[in-house]
Every structure is written in structure tokens, then in C-alpha cells.
């Protein structure tokens, strides 16, 4: 057991052109915090895959407000280290993700909002108990400077925190066969419980008599470095004597990946692609629990009470993503009906309705005709958020106050002549055409294109339709 410690030194614009805008402003002051996620081994994993070695969240940094016109400086940082405790052996090789988050503190109804500002990732080798390692990582125009180390928690010591130390029973020396525990010279190595000869640097055990190897080491006592450079074939198990991979069955034979993981061969061995909620070399370990606080922006962590059940984040309205890290443009869902204007106020959506509509989503059609009168015998028709008059023959306009010229729109087709009439209009059709609007040709045999002429009218007669 031990602790991985991360010290953030600075977060600010990187060198070169295109300095980023400050994430904070006078209108929207903000403060930063950091999240670190650790995974064992050197596998290139997606940002969403679980933090198998552990995760930690920093405190909030000091509130920062941009000075108008000034370039974005290094931003004020939270105090203290980020500490990620690990229960088992330190793997020696690990992948990390460090996220910089911004907490907006503007006049937000319903509290602050969080958004991801930058994410850096890397893969490193690191022995526990060693000095601080310094690093610089860039994400877009931002630059993050930090140091990290892994240290063992007593009584564990060694580069993997697998050797145990105990206070000396006698003041002067350790018991038979036991060495002093460097660097704790006043303590003694605890009696070995691993298989005799198991490498104290590259092997460890969880059960008496076993010897399990850290990544990069092989052999029954974990004393042989894995190396493929002088080998003829990249397939098969490691030779305990040379560390070479000798020909043998394919590494994915029998699918070594548990819990529904899929296996793919790599130049050195195999790699498991694990389903959501599982991780590890063989997908044998389940993922982050709710205790790791994976949900942002007020999200509630559901499930994930223990490492065998995957968590889900229930996100507040306005956020989405597996960790509620993405802000949603709720207006893009076009929730306002009948042409209403959508406003996302953060704490709620508002719809500004067009005239004639009301309700939270402009869903109610108001009585457009209330108090409206249509002149000259017209009748009011609702619709479209504004009243409309259906006018009696001979009248037009919004309120049927205008006397209409029924021939103004040239309603008679094929050269027919239009006559205004007290009850509408009459079309006198040109030879060869008939119909109320002269729209039907008369066939040469005297039959018309109409199914039947109205009784009392011969084809070619002027027709008046009331």
C-alpha cells in the first residue's frame, strides 16, 4: 500500500502564438480545481475508462477575475497535494490523466457550474520511494507543470511497496536472515511470505508462497526482464532463462479477457478491450465507485456502491455525458412551440411566446377572435396566433372593410372575360372553353372535360357560380 502524490506547479498559457483567453472574466469570476486519474500499466486507455489505480480531486483554487486587456497569466492554484492512495502493489508503470476544471462563480441562479478546461494524459515508469519527477504537459494552448512521486505507507517498502518492515525487536540488530529496511534503518524487513527467491524489486505476492511479476518482468521468480529484441517470434510465453518470447500458441487463444472483454494481439503479448465498468490486464477488475466522486455539475452518482457494480451519473437538466461534464444547449431541442423564442437561463428554460400563444412552452393557442369583429358579415377564424376574417362575397381586407374587386386577380382562364356581379364574379369563356373559371377545354365532339355539365347549362355558356 502507498500513496501517489501530485503537485501542480502552474497552469497557464503555453509558449508560442495563440495565447488562450482567460477562462475567467469580471462578469464571470472563476476558480480552478484539478482531477487526477491513474491506471496501471502503459495501455492507451480512453479518458472515460475507469481509474483503476485511483482518482483524486483537489481543493478549489482562489477566486480569479481577469483584468481587462491583460493576457491570461498563470492562474491561481489550489493549495496542497493531490493524493491517490493505492491498496496493492505499486505497478511501476502507469498511465495518468490530469484534468483542469473551471468552477464558474458568476451570478448563476442555482449555484456554480463546472466545465472541463484542459485534459492531459501520459504514460510513465516510476519506482515507489524515488524522488519527485517533474513534468510539463500541453493541452491546446494551455501548459500544465507538475511533479509526482509514489511513496509507500509503512510498513510497506521497496519500489513496488510490497516488502514489509516492522520495528526492530532488539535495539542493535535484526533477527536471523532479516535485513535492515532501507531507508528506515531502525526497522527490519518482515519475514518473507512470498516464494523463496522471489525478486523483492520486481515480484510481489498476495498469498504466501506465490511470486507475481510486475509488468516488464517474467520468470518464476520475476528476475528476467521481458525483452523481444533478440527473439525470432513475437508469439508465445516468455522463456524463463532468456526473457525472449518463443514460438507458441497465439496470446489470444482461449480469450484471456474476462467479463466480456475482447482480445487483440500486440507485438509483445495481448491487449484486452474491456466493457464499461471493468479494467485491468484481463478486465478482471471492476471500475470506479461512487466513492470516487465521478459526477460533476451537481450530478448524482447512482449504483457503483462497490467495485463490482458500475456507476451511472444522473445529470441535472442542462448537463450530459457519462460524468455530467458536458453542458447541453437545451434550446437546440427546440422546446418552444408555435414559433416561440427559447432562452436558456441556466436554472431553467424560458419560452418567449409569439402574440396569440401562451404557456411554459407556448403550447396554448389563445382565443385570437376575442373582442375582434369582422365587418360586412365576415366571420372570425382563429389560427397562427393572429385572428383572420373570412369575408363575405364582395368584401376583403383584414377586417372585411374593403369592397373587393373580384376581377382584380384575373380569375378567368384561357382568355375568358371577367364581369363583376353583386354576388361574385362571372367568367365569359372564349370559344372552346367552359367552367366557372373557363378552366376546362371543350372536346371537338361536343363533350366537355367535365364529368357532366350542370343541368340547364350548355357547354360554352357563360357560367356563374354563387
Amino acid at each position: 500500500a502507498g500513496v501517489f502524490e501530485l503537485q501542480i506547479h502552474s497552469f497557464g498559457p503555453g509558449p508560442g502564438p495563440g495565447a488562450p483567453r482567460s477562462p475567467c472574466s469580471a462578469r464571470l469570476p472563476c476558480r480552478l480545481f484539478f482531477r487526477v486519474c491513474l491506471k496501471p500499466g502503459l495501455s492507451e486507455e480512453a479518458a472515460e475508462s475507469p481509474c483503476a489505480l485511483g482518482a483524486a480531486l483537489s481543493a478549489r483554487g482562489p477566486v480569479y477575475t481577469e483584468q481587462p486587456g491583460a493576457p491570461a497569466p498563470d492562474l491561481p492554484l489550489p493549495d496542497g497535494l493531490l493524493q491517490v492512495p493505492f491498496r496493492d502493489a505499486w505497478p511501476g508503470t502507469f498511465s495518468f490523466i490530469i484534468e483542469t476544471w473551471r468552477e464558474e462563480l458568476g451570478d448563476q441562479i442555482g449555484g456554480p457550474a463546472w466545465s472541463l478546461l484542459a485534459r492531459v494524459a501520459g504514460r510513465r515508469r516510476l519506482a515507489a520511494g524515488g524522488p519527485w519527477a517533474r513534468d510539463i504537459q500541453r493541452a491546446g494552448a494551455w501548459e500544465l507543470r507538475f511533479s509526482y512521486r509514489a511513496r509507500c505507507e509503512p510498513p510497506a517498502v521497496g519500489t513496488a511497496c510490497t516488502r514489509l518492515c516492522r520495528p526492530r525487536s532488539a535495539p542493535s540488530r535484526c533477527g536471523p536472515g532479516l535485513r535492515p529496511c532501507a531507508p528506515l534503518e531502525d526497522e527490519c524487513e518482515a519475514p518473507l511470505v512470498c516464494r523463496a527467491g522471489c525478486s523483492p524489486e520486481h515480484g510481489f505476492c498476495e498469498q504466501p508462497g506465490e511470486c507475481r511479476c510486475l509488468e516488464g518482468w517474467t520468470g518464476p521468480l520475476c528476475t528476467v526482464p521481458v525483452s523481444t529484441s533478440s527473439c525470432l517470434s513475437p508469439r508465445g510465453p516468455s522463456s524463463a532463462t532468456t526473457g525472449c518470447l518463443v514460438p507458441g500458441p497465439g496470446p489470444c487463444d482461449g480469450n484471456p479477457c474476462a467479463n466480456g472483454g475482447s482480445c487483440s494481439e500486440t507485438p509483445r503479448s495481448f491487449e484486452c478491450t474491456c466493457p464499461r465498468g471493468f479494467y485491468g490486464l484481463r478486465c478482471e477488475v471492476s471500475g470506479v465507485t461512487c466513492a470516487d466522486g465521478p459526477c460533476f455539475n451537481g450530478g448524482l452518482c447512482v449504483g457503483g456502491a462497490d467495485p463490482d457494480s458500475a456507476y451511472i451519473c444522473h445529470c441535472p437538466p442542462g448537463f450530459q455525458g457519462s460524468n455530467c461534464e458536458k453542458r447541453v444547449d437545451r434550446c437546440s431541442l427546440q422546446p418552444c412551440r408555435n414559433g416561440g423564442l427559447c432562452l436558456d437561463l441556466g436554472h431553467a428554460l424560458r419560452c418567449r411566446c409569439r402574440a396569440g400563444f401562451a404557456g411554459p412552452r407556448c403550447e396554448h393557442d389563445l382565443d385570437d377572435c376575442a373582442g375582434r369583429a369582422c365587418a360586412n358579415g365576415g366571420t372570425c377564424v382563429e389560427g397562427g396566433g393572429a385572428h383572420r376574417c373570412s369575408c363575405a362575397l364582395g368584401f376583403g381586407g383584414r377586417d372585411c372593410r374593403e369592397r373587393a374587386d373580384p376581377c382584380a386577380a384575373r380569375p378567368c382562364a384561357h382568355g375568358g372575360r371577367c364581369y363583376a356581379h353583386f354576388s361574385g364574379l362571372v367568367c365569359a369563356c372564349a370559344p372552346g372553353y367552359m367552367g366557372a373559371r373557363c378552366e376546362f377545354p371543350v372536346h371537338p365532339d361536343g363533350a366537355s372535360a367535365l364529368p357532366a355539365a350542370p343541368p340547364g347549362l350548355r357547354p360554352g355558356d357563360p357560367q356563374r357560380y354563387l
Epitope: 461512487c290 451537481g298 448524482l300 452518482c301 441535472p316 437538466p317 436554472h347
Partner: antibody
């Protein structure tokens, strides 16, 4: 002004189903999560469950097998059904709105007392 | 589930005095997702504090919240007659949502 009003029978017989409705005014039921909380006489608060209009629900494991929460967006209402009730389910039942900044309760109904007795 | 333990069960004070109420969580509450409510007899609870320290709309500044991790505190700097009530804490870090057992602040 957001207002919530619970209603339903005040007396339910043991082994029957308790049914309550909460009418929401001043806020669209589609914009928030909505929850039910109960408080036995003289005791503390117990969260029952919540719902989002999309159908997402989450119930207290201690009540999960007996609880159903639903919403009717057209009426701006949510409802609670609790089956196989016993005297231990006698309580004041509150509906509440869940805030957008997190899963806490920013508006509450005045509560309705439901007594389970034969 | 996260169990919230409030102490003391009852706090007897006079108007004008300072009240300090404690809420302790059985597991760490991430991101300070903790709220405080006030409840008077025959009424529904009223939100006072969220995010451990942010005052809800319309809450007087004599109410303040603090703490992180497993230990949280609600402080009423000078008790007014209308502040005598029962106070509950609630965590909203993970499901199930849980409340503390309450602290009753009554008049000495």
C-alpha cells in the same frame, strides 16, 4: 412563483396501494427532476424516489420493490404509488422539486398526511 | 449508503445566541454535495444551504454553512425568534439521497 400541491386519500387500509398526486404550478414539469419524500409523525425525513420527464427514475432501495413514480406532462403532475402498505408507511408525504445545481430540494409542497389503518 | 449523524439532538439556546449544528457523514461527501433545511412544526422543510456553504435565495446571512469531507457545520450567528425549529442535513453526492436525523433548536 413555484407551487406544489399534494392530494390523495388520507386513509389507506393495510396491504392496499397508497396513491398520491402532486400538481405543479409556476414551473414546467419537463424542466426539472421531481421527488417524493416522507416523514413519519415525530420522526425525520426519508427520500422515496425521483423522476425526470424523460422517464429516468431512481428509488430508495428500502422501498424500491413497492414504489412507482410517474409524471403526466400534459397536466404538469407527478404521482406516487406505494403498494402493500403497512402501519409503518403512515407519514406526511411531500412532493418536492430537485434543484438544477444538484439533487437537493428547493421547493416543497405543504405535505399530506396518509394514515394506514384498518 | 451514506449515513448522516446530526448532533446534538437538541440545542437549547436563547435569542441572540450563536447556534452551531454538526452533521457527520459515514463516508466522505464528494464535492461538498451537502444541503441544510429548516422545518417548523406543521410546515414543509425549507432549503437554507446547498453545496455545504452556499445560501439559498432569500436566506438571511446569519445562516452559514461550512465543512468538507465527512464533517459539516451549520452556524446561526445570532438566533432570532423565528429560527427555533428542527434542522436537517442532506447529502446529494450519491444514491440513495439521505437525511440526517435532525437537530431541534429550542428556546432555553
Amino acid at each position: 412563483q413555484v407551487q406544489l400541491q399534494e392530494w390523495g386519500p388520507g386513509l389507506v387500509k393495510p396491504s392496499e396501494t397508497l396513491s398520491l398526486t402532486c400538481t405543479v404550478s409556476g414551473a414546467s414539469i419537463s424542466s426539472f427532476y421531481w421527488s417524493w419524500i416522507r416523514q413519519p409523525p415525530g420522526k425525520g425525513l426519508e427520500w422515496i424516489g425521483y423522476i425526470y420527464y424523460s422517464g429516468t427514475t431512481n428509488y430508495n432501495p428500502s422501498l424500491k420493490s413497492r414504489v412507482t413514480i410517474s409524471v403526466d406532462t400534459s397536466k404538469n403532475q407527478l404521482s406516487l404509488k406505494l403498494s402493500s402498505v403497512t402501519a409503518a408507511d403512515t407519514a406526511v408525504y411531500y412532493c418536492a422539486r430537485i434543484a438544477v445545481a444538484g439533487f437537493f430540494f428547493d421547493y416543497w409542497g405543504q405535505g399530506t398526511l396518509v394514515t394506514v389503518s384498518s | 449508503e451514506i449515513v448522516l449523524t446530526q448532533s446534538p439532538g437538541t440545542l437549547s439556546l436563547s435569542p441572540g445566541e450563536r447556534a452551531t449544528l454538526s452533521c457527520r457523514a459515514s463516508q466522505s461527501v464528494n464535492k461538498n454535495y451537502l444541503a441544510w433545511y429548516q422545518q417548523k412544526p406543521g410546515q414543509a422543510p425549507r432549503l437554507l444551504i446547498y453545496g455545504a456553504s452556499s445560501r439559498a435565495t432569500g436566506i438571511p446571512d446569519r445562516f452559514s454553512g461550512s465543512g468538507s469531507g465527512t464533517d459539516f457545520t451549520l452556524t446561526i450567528s445570532r438566533l432570532e425568534p423565528e429560527d427555533f425549529a428542527v434542522y436537517y442535513c442532506q447529502q446529494y453526492d450519491r444514491s440513495p439521497l439521505t437525511f440526517g436525523g435532525g437537530t431541534k433548536v429550542d428556546i432555553k
